[in-house]
């Protein structure tokens, strides 16, 4: 038994870092592999993730942490019983993934104006609270073509558009996701899609009534 | 109520070995790291060794290392130090002390917040 | 190995009176999370040393609120307020953050 891809790891830096790797051949991770991380600090203890198969060959462990910082850095030791495989250290600060906001909903009763708002995915202690920028996918679910992002780059997790700037009278889905440019994150996951359809009067037809009267 | 108290102290000549044990009763003994710490007459506090909860994480001063073992029996809630190659400068008051949670990912830590007694370890011929 | 150094090694107070002693570490014994792993001691003629001030701010339980704790860093203070005879002993710092821990020599207070 041999790791083909060692293992690379992700921190959402709250609660949980995820590893992956890739095994030589088909292998039940749960039974067969242990990854075994430690902080490295004085008189911590190693802890023991049991890791899900992820594909034929591939494993994924999710390694919970009490909370993390900068200077935290963990060993890491992938055993298969008895036999070390794999031993490595893992940063989280050096290697964060966001959690992807949730909550997203879309506004439609403010007059021709879409407000879009979803909630931040950190508490307000946590570092990242405060760092969190934003990409909003809106798309249309009748035309492919029809599928814009939007950057969120203030602090606010919300967005305002004019529904004018998107087809009246379809249905239109949006997603966010998340990253913070002072660790220089990846991208979150994008959040559920919320849907709604968009409906406004055209501004002819706004002018065209106003003369009726 | 926590309670640490030592035993095991007593009078050896250079060159032997004695062992210290440490009771403990009042508080959840697994989850705790374990320290002794040292005090020669008249003189400050010097530490001597500490261990995790579950025993795996071991470490020494200088001064003892590969002549003193740190060790723990969570089914006893004691915690031993075992002194051989005994020296005239080990002559001290011995004392554990209830360290950090161990068991957490990062430490908790909030001192050292009990004590024993001290059990007092005399070297000399 | 962290050095920690006490200053003063002696110091003489009034009852009622304000003591400070001072703590410096050779180096930083704050980690990222922000804690001072540095903790404060006193031990009375006989006895086992007792916790006083822990991760440099704390008051341990029991603790009379006359004790407090200051600084980051390198530079620390133990400050008792209104000192009692009670008080009398020796002060320690301890440094926790990394193996082997260390302690300052001690600081002897008593009373004038």
């Known amino acids: 038994m041999k790791v083909l891809q060692e293992p690379t790891c992700v921190s959402d830096y709250m609660s949980i870092s995820t590893c992956e790797w890739k095994m030589n051949g088909p292998t039940n991770c749960s039974t067969e592999l242990r990854l075994l991380y430690q902080l490295v600090f004085l008189l911590s203890e190693a802890h023991t993730c049991i890791p899900e198969n992820n594909g034929g060959a591939g494993c994924v462990c999710h390694l919970l942490m009490d909370d993390v910082v900068s200077a935290d850095n963990y060993t890491l030791d992938l055993w298969a019983g008895q036999q070390l495989l794999w031993k490595g250290s893992f940063k989280p600060s050096e290697h964060v993934k966001p959690r992807a906001p949730g909550n997203l909903t879309v506004h439609t009763n403010v007059s021709d104006t879409l407000l879009l708002t979803w909630s931040n995915p950190y508490p307000p202690d946590n570092y990242l609270y405060n760092h969190l920028t934003y990409a909003v996918n809106i798309w249309s679910e009748n035309d492919p073509a029809d599928f814009r992002i939007y950057n969120v780059t203030y602090l606010e997790p919300s967005l305002r558009i004019a529904a004018s700037t998107l087809k009246s009278g379809i249905s239109y889905r949006a997603r966010v996701r998340a990253w913070a440019q002072c660790y220089n994150t990846t991208w979150s996951e994008w959040s559920p899609s919320t849907k709604w359809h968009n409906s406004y009067r055209e501004p002819f037809e706004q002018h065209h009534h106003h003369h009726h009267h | 109520e926590v309670q640490l108290v030592e035993s095991g102290g007593g009078l050896v000549q250079p060159g032997g070995s004695l062992r210290l044990s440490c009771a403990v009763s009042?508080?959840?003994?697994?989850?705790?790291?374990m320290s002794w710490v040292r005090q020669a007459p008249g003189k400050g506090l010097e530490w001597v060794s500490s261990?995790?909860?579950?025993?795996?994480?071991?470490y020494y001063a200088d001064s003892v290392k590969g002549r003193f073992t740190i060790s723990r029996d969570n089914s006893k809630n004691t915690v031993y130090l075992q002194m051989n190659s005994l020296r005239a400068e080990d002559t001290a008051v011995y004392y554990c002390?209830?360290?950090?949670?161990?068991?957490?990912?990062?430490?908790?830590?909030?001192?050292?917040?009990?004590w024993g007694q001290g059990t007092t370890v005399t070297v000399s011929s | 190995d962290i050095v920690m150094t006490q200053s003063p090694l002696s110091l003489p107070v009034t009852p009622g009176e304000p003591a400070s002693i001072s703590c410096r570490s050779s180096?930083?014994?704050?980690?990222?999370?922000?804690?001072?792993?540095l903790d404060w001691y006193l031990q009375k003629s006989g006895q086992s040393p007792q916790l006083l001030i822990y991760?440099?701010?704390n008051v341990a339980a029991g603790v009379p609120d006359r004790f407090s704790g200051s600084g980051s860093g390198t530079d620390f203070t133990l400050k008792i307020s209104r000192v009692e005879a009670e008080d009398v002993g020796f002060y320690y710092c301890?440094?926790?953050?990394?193996?082997?821990?260390?302690f300052g020599q001690g600081t002897k207070l008593e009373i004038k």
């Open positions: 002390a209830k360290d950090r949670i161990s068991i957490t990912i990062r430490p908790r830590y909030f001192g050292l917040d009990f």
């Open positions: 009042g508080f959840t003994f697994s989850s705790y790291a």
């Open positions: 261990i995790t909860g579950g025993g795996g994480g071991i």
């Open positions: 180096q930083n014994v704050v980690y990222g999370n922000g804690y001072n792993y």
């Open positions: 991760l440099g701010t």
């Open positions: 301890m440094q926790s953050l990394q193996a082997p821990y260390t």
